[in-house]
């Protein structure tokens, strides 16, 4: 096909393919009517001036996972409808200026994973076409201003996996068309107020794993269109009160794995799109009434591994569509009554590793849907009668590592145990703790004459005497909640994020992967 | 008759990690929790977590990070495995059980201890 | 985390004497619903592991003699030896459970 390299293979549709070791330069005579060349896993460890003059066609050109260290300037010279161009996973350290001049097509210049110690404003200067800009995985401290001036139509800048410690607050001004902005896994400790002014179109900012400690209060303020905020991983220790009050698009907002003491009531401002809130890994302490009221679509809130010692009756107000609420491992040691109240379509729950000495008998009163209730891994003795009587669709109930308490009292949980151990899962079944004659004994078989009666000694009621069998022999995978494969964090929705562990880990918040979204 | 014996104890260089074991007998792990507790020479008791019947576990925050505790029942054996060595780390080490108490965190039985060094 | 903190340090008491060793908490012990103080004591003589004494703050362990006493509410606790013995010479430490457990720092008491 006009001339195919012998180390290339070229195909009808005009793309090239160049690969291997034994390749040091770029191979020659390419054909002149190649519209995508692709040089990958090469030895090449430079480009010389031109080596790409005769294939002025060229839309888009792939030079990755290189020994590539220099650029001659005028390397892309001819080029000029060369829309996409990536240079990523070679060993770049400096750009010569005017490496870019004369790409007036260009759209996308992929540039990540290099070793660039820094950019300059006349580095981009004549990349007026611009739509996506990769820097993500390099050596960057700091951002000159004026760097990103002239590319006034930049949707798309990953500045992520950098060493960037501060940003200056016009760095983005001239970006009004941006709309994903990431500045992932750098060491920022602040951002300025009016940092983010500018970019009025922006629908992801990704500020995860930086060392923020504080938010200005107006930070968000100008980006109305803001729909994926990723804030976690960071050393944020309070929230100003109106910090989040202009996110009306917000649909996803990760908060994990700060240093968070406490949440205001109303913090989090109106967001009616937000489905997903977590917030697990902070030092809440307590939650008070109406923290949440704002996030009426809100299906998915996870709080574990705080130290939540107290929730407010009234902490859980407005979540009437919340699914799935994970508290476990806290510092719980009572709920009130009602505090569940107002989670009609709750399905999941996990209290589990927590305090918690007794449960109010009408704690999940108004809860009917409830498919799954972590318990286990707390203090508690008995429960109340009927607690779970009318919880029909009850599938997965985890009472194990209690210290039950199995003198008479413990009857009536005894014979609905009994009559219901599908539910219980058959791998770790409650035990009893006292009296110490009959500690560790299955709760469910354990002969209760033998225990030592208690004071009060109560007629014995029943929960509900039918037995209960699911329809199904597992609980269906997409709303599973059986703690095999969890995801230590959310999948934060990139296509160039390199890394999104999965890990069997047990501990994050008590529901499994499919249930991360 | 109850026993707890601890070993795996040594010395160990600053940066590694160890593994005690805990070999229980007259009672069964899958009916009683186990508890860890370390000693440093001269020094005051500190809880450093448990492992319940169910395979529960909480840890020490301090520690969380450093530690991690599990369990074969068939081989009515506990373990604490501790990453990231310190000097500070040198103590004498202890796992306990709750078998008599109506104090579910109480400890009751003790065993012998095993004793850790750190240093280079 | 609740911090535990004993005094005194140490106690030198004469045979057949009270010794009285305090305990204070950072925040309340006191579960308002199962009206339970979760603190106990522990005994530790030399060379020994350590021997569950009193829990619930007032409830002495089978077998412990009579002579040890526990008391106290919230975040005040007390263990009383009413007639030191020879044999009782050894660190004293209290317990929470309130929440994970945490240890005092100890008190030694020995014969004056």
């Known amino acids: 096909y006009h001339g195919c390299p012998s180390e290339c293979t070229c195909s009808r549709a005009s793309q090239v393919e160049c690969t291997g070791a034994r390749i040091v330069a770029v191979p020659t005579p390419l054909p002149w009517n190649a519209m995508s060349l692709q040089i990958l896993n090469t030895h090449i460890t430079e480009l010389n001036e031109s080596p790409f003059l005769n294939i002025s066609a060229l839309i888009a050109l792939r030079i990755e996972k290189n020994e590539l260290s220099r650029i001659t300037p005028g390397a892309f010279r001819n080029l000029g409808s060369l829309r996409y161009l990536s240079l990523a996973n070679n060993k770049l350290q400096v750009l010569p200026i005017g490496l870019f001049q004369g790409l007036d097509s260009l759209e996308s210049l992929l540039l990540s994973s290099n070793q660039l110690l820094q950019i300059q404003p006349a580095h981009f200067s004549q990349c007026s076409n611009l739509k996506e800009l990769q820097l993500h995985g390099n050596h960057l401290e700091y951002i000159p201003d004026g760097a990103f001036d002239h590319l006034v139509g930049l949707t798309k800048l990953n500045l992520g996996k950098n060493s960037l410690t501060h940003i200056s607050p016009r760095v983005f001004q001239h970006l009004g068309n941006l709309q994903v902005l990431r500045l992932y896994e750098n060491r920022l400790t602040d951002i300025p107020m009016g940092t983010f002014d500018g970019l009025v179109n922006l629908q992801e900012l990704a500020l995860q794993q930086n060392q923020i400690g504080l938010l200005s209060p107006g930070l968000f303020h100008n980006n109305h269109n803001l729909q994926r905020l990723y804030l976690s991983n960071n050393h944020i220790s309070q929230l100003p009160p109106s910090v989040f009050m202009q996110l009306p698009q917000l649909n996803r907002l990760t908060l994990f794995g700060n240093s968070l003491k406490e949440l205001s009531p109303g913090i989090f401002g109106p967001m009616p799109n937000l489905r997903e809130l977590w917030l697990y890994d902070n030092h809440i302490s307590s939650l008070p009434d109406n923290v949440f009221s704002n996030l009426r679509q809100l299906q998915v809130l996870i709080l574990s591994r705080n130290q939540i010692s107290f929730i407010s009756p009234g902490a859980f107000n407005g979540l009437t569509e919340l699914r799935e609420l994970s508290l476990h491992t806290n510092a719980l040691q009572d709920l009130d009554g009602n505090v569940f109240r107002m989670l009609a379509n709750l399905q999941n729950i996990s209290l589990q590793n927590n305090r918690l000495r007794q449960l109010p008998g009408n704690i999940f009163a108004n809860v009917n849907g409830l498919m799954a209730i972590q318990l286990q891994n707390n203090q508690l003795e008995n429960l109340p009668l009927g607690i779970f009587d009318h919880l029909g669709k009850l599938c997965e109930l985890r009472l194990y590592d209690n210290p039950w308490r199995c003198d008479s009292d413990i009857l009536p949980l005894r014979n609905w145990l009994l009559l219901n151990q599908p539910r219980l899962g058959t791998d770790t079944v409650p035990v009893c703790f006292s009296p110490a004659n009959v500690r560790g004994q299955s709760l469910i078989i354990i002969n209760v004459n033998v225990a030592v009666p208690s004071v009060h000694v109560p007629e014995v009621p029943s929960y509900p005497e039918t037995p209960w069998y699911p329809d199904t022999p597992s609980y269906p995978d997409t709303t599973s909640v059986s703690s095999t494969t969890e995801l230590t964090s959310p999948v934060e929705d990139y296509t160039d994020l390199t890394t999104i562990q999965v890990t069997d880990d047990r501990s994050v918040w008590g529901m499994t992967q499919a249930q991360s979204g | 008759e109850v026993q707890l014996v601890e070993s795996g104890g040594g010395l160990v260089q600053p940066g590694g990690s160890l593994r005690l074991s805990c070999a229980v007998s007259g009672f069964s792990l899958t009916s009683y929790g186990v508890h860890w507790v370390r000693q440093a020479t001269g020094k005051g008791l500190e809880w450093l977590g448990h492992?319940?019947?169910?395979?529960?576990?909480n840890y020490n925050s301090a520690l969380m990070s450093r530690l991690t505790i599990s369990k074969e029942n068939a081989k009515s054996s506990v373990y604490l495995q501790m990453n990231s060595l310190r000097a500070g780390d040198t103590a004498m080490y202890y796992c306990?059980?709750?078998?008599?108490?109506?104090?579910?965190?109480?400890?009751?039985?003790w065993g012998q201890g095993t004793t850790v060094t750190v240093s280079s | 985390d609740i911090v535990m903190t004993q005094s005194p340090d140490s106690l030198a008491v004469s045979l057949g004497e009270r010794a009285t060793i305090n305990c204070k908490s950072s925040q309340s012990l006191l579960n308002s619903r199962t009206r339970k103080n979760y603190l106990a004591w522990y005994q530790q003589k030399p060379g020994q592991s350590p021997k569950l004494l009193i829990y619930w703050a007032s409830t002495r362990e089978s077998g412990v003699p009579d002579r040890f006493s526990g008391s106290g509410s919230g975040t005040d606790f007390t263990l009383t030896i009413s007639s030191l013995q020879a044999e009782d010479v050894a660190v004293y430490y209290c317990?929470?459970?309130?929440?994970?457990?945490?240890f005092g720092g100890g008190t030694k008491v020995e014969i004056k």
């Open positions: 492992i319940w019947a169910g395979g529960s576990t």
């Open positions: 306990a059980t709750h078998m008599i108490t109506e104090d579910y965190y109480g400890m009751d039985y």
């Open positions: 317990k929470q459970s309130y929440n994970l457990p945490t």
